[in-house]
Interface confidence: medium
Amino acid sequence: RGVFRRDAHKSEVAHRFKDLGEENFKALVLIAFAQYLQQCPFEDHVKLVNEVTEFAKTCVADESAENCDKSLHTLFGDKLCTVATLRETYGEMADCCAKQEPERNECFLQHKDDNPNLPRLVRPEVDVMCTAFHDNEETFLKKYLYEIARRHPYFYAPELLFFAKRYKAAFTECCQAADKAACLLPKLDELRDEGKASSAKQRLKCASLQKFGERAFKAWAVARLSQRFPKAEFAEVSKLVTDLTKVHTECCHGDLLECADDRADLAKYICENQDSISSKLKECCEKPLLEKSHCIAEVENDEMPADLPSLAADFVESKDVCKNYAEAKDVFLGMFLYEYARRHPDYSVVLLLRLAKTYETTLEKCCAAADPHECYAKVFDEFKPLVEEPQNLIKQNCELFEQLGEYKFQNALLVRYTKKVPQVSTPTLVEVSRNLGKVGSKCCKHPEAKRMPCAEDYLSVVLNQLCVLHEKTPVSDRVTKCCTESLVNRRPCFSALEVDETYVPKEFNAETFTFHADICTLSEKERQIKKQTALVELVKHKPKATKEQLKAVMDDFAAFVEKCCKADDKETCFAEEGKKLVAASQAALGL
């Protein structure tokens, strides 16, 4: 069964149960429910999942049984709407239950919360975790799925199954190791960091589909897959793009069973046709399903064919350019993007999309002109400044990163972005700037040819986090403008923002700069976040403060924390020295 051929099934739920198997079926339904009802207790979700699973089994036994012919949205929506505390817990989301499908599902989707009010996940002691794992492995792993899914309502569900498999493997191995902590903690840290990155990448895919439409996502996929599979024919890349779009549309739309099923079909297709796709797939295709799909998604770019001719011949010099464009605009532009991307693994996907947009705009104008060829003859010259802009930006920022190191580079970005958009909440500015700053350690180590795709495509993911968080509570017209005008120009839009001269500085509040002894017991990362929170607040109070002034205050602050954490009476030190620090800072900044 291909991704595109949907055989007629009497019962969709029975079909998916049989395709996916009971274990994956239950896991995916749990993820789906947790992503919709993010505040519900674990036990409630497990109960709902068990009820759905038992129902699915009756449909497997007899596809004609009552209600087995209902759509998955109807079945799942009906089940979610049985939750007794829906109105108290979710407020207006309960109104979704008064709607019919497909409006009801759309309503649930609109109420997904990217920043749910949930407590931070605290990691228990290793022995406590190992005991819980051994006592009830199934519940332990379900709890993992539940906790990740409710905090990341757009997490790519089939990929979360892969994370859960690795999570289980880590506990299986490490809970019987001599030094459990040394074995387990680095693995859990790695899963946590990879999980956050995976969630953010998927959030951009869903935003692309939901805010900018299928055409935008397909363009992104053509560019990325053409870079990855430069030996594949255009028709092959187009097939993969169409299938991949279907998979992500399903997952972003909450159709997790269909998404996981279709992703498995796509992996199967790719592996059966690897000779016409890429020489790099062999190892991936020998792995079990979840690992295989993950591996394919991360596979390195194949080598470019050696004999690729100049692009100008087909897309500038040919007398058929306007004819080909007129006959099938999207196909011709798709071919242009394919041909350009397969020749440029050194460009970011967003840059390739900017070039394709420029080419499209030029053809729109020139193919209506008196002399089309004369009009579009220099179109490739228009690409030069578009290519140089990210190249120069990356060069400058990598130099700054190498000079400052990650923490101070993050601080420089915190100041830069707080001055650009000071209305944005402090936690969001800290989170986003810290992530922007990670581009340095992630990408600056790469050679020139890999820097731009690494850096600019990563920045697109991070800026999307800012966009989705800001959309929940919009406070800045400038953020809204950069986020909504053009998906591919978000980063240049934010880069071009200068200091917001209209901003009225925040009133000074000493409480914001009052610290206590508990800071001493925090991890290095948490301590950094405290200091960076203070830095953002300083800039919001004094947006015109110079780098030097801010550096002096932050150096004093670091010395103050270090001194008081070494003191015998820490709390008294923080109280007395803190007052002095606030006064000195106010004086230094002229507050």
């Epitope: 595109f4 092959e236 169409t242 071919m335």
Partner: nanobody, 119 residues
Framework: EVQLLESGGGLVQPGGSLRLSCAAS????????MLWVRQAPGKGLEWVSV????????YYADSVKGRFTISRDNSKNTLYLQMNSLRAEDTAVYYC????????????RGQGTLVTVSS
């Protein structure tokens, strides 16, 4: 040797339908993307539709979108073009061809079948 043999053309009234077939041999049909092109009297070749080796996705020229449907039967090594709501401007010789990796052109094409739309 690659051979492509089109059939199914003929005279039809505006608004009518025709189904073209193309029998392929001499190459591995089920690993080749295929397309239909056409040439109206006194005009150049015009691209009509492409189909991937697996049967999906399919692509259409803007001028035929919603009226023409391309399909294939890999077990019979045959390509099809279902043409509905035909218009006078669809009059042309229709060719099936192998779709290559580059350009909106092709490696091989058949002898063609003439479709005339006239009242």
């Amino acid at each position: 040797e690659v051979q492509l043999l089109e059939s199914g053309g003929g005279l039809v009234q505006p608004g009518g339908s025709l189904r073209l077939s193309c029998a392929a041999s001499g190459f591995t049909f089920d690993t080749s993307s295929m397309l239909w092109v056409r040439q109206a009297p006194g005009k150049g070749l015009e691209w009509v539709s492409v189909i991937h080796q697996s049967g999906t996705p399919t692509y259409y020229a803007d001028s035929v979108k919603g009226r023409f449907t391309i399909s294939r039967d890999n077990s019979k090594n045959t390509l099809y073009l279902q043409m509905n709501s035909l218009r006078a401007e669809d009059t042309a010789v229709y060719y099936c061809a192998k779709f290559p990796s580059r350009k909106m052109k092709f490696d091989y094409r058949g002898q063609g079948t003439l479709v005339t739309v006239s009242s």
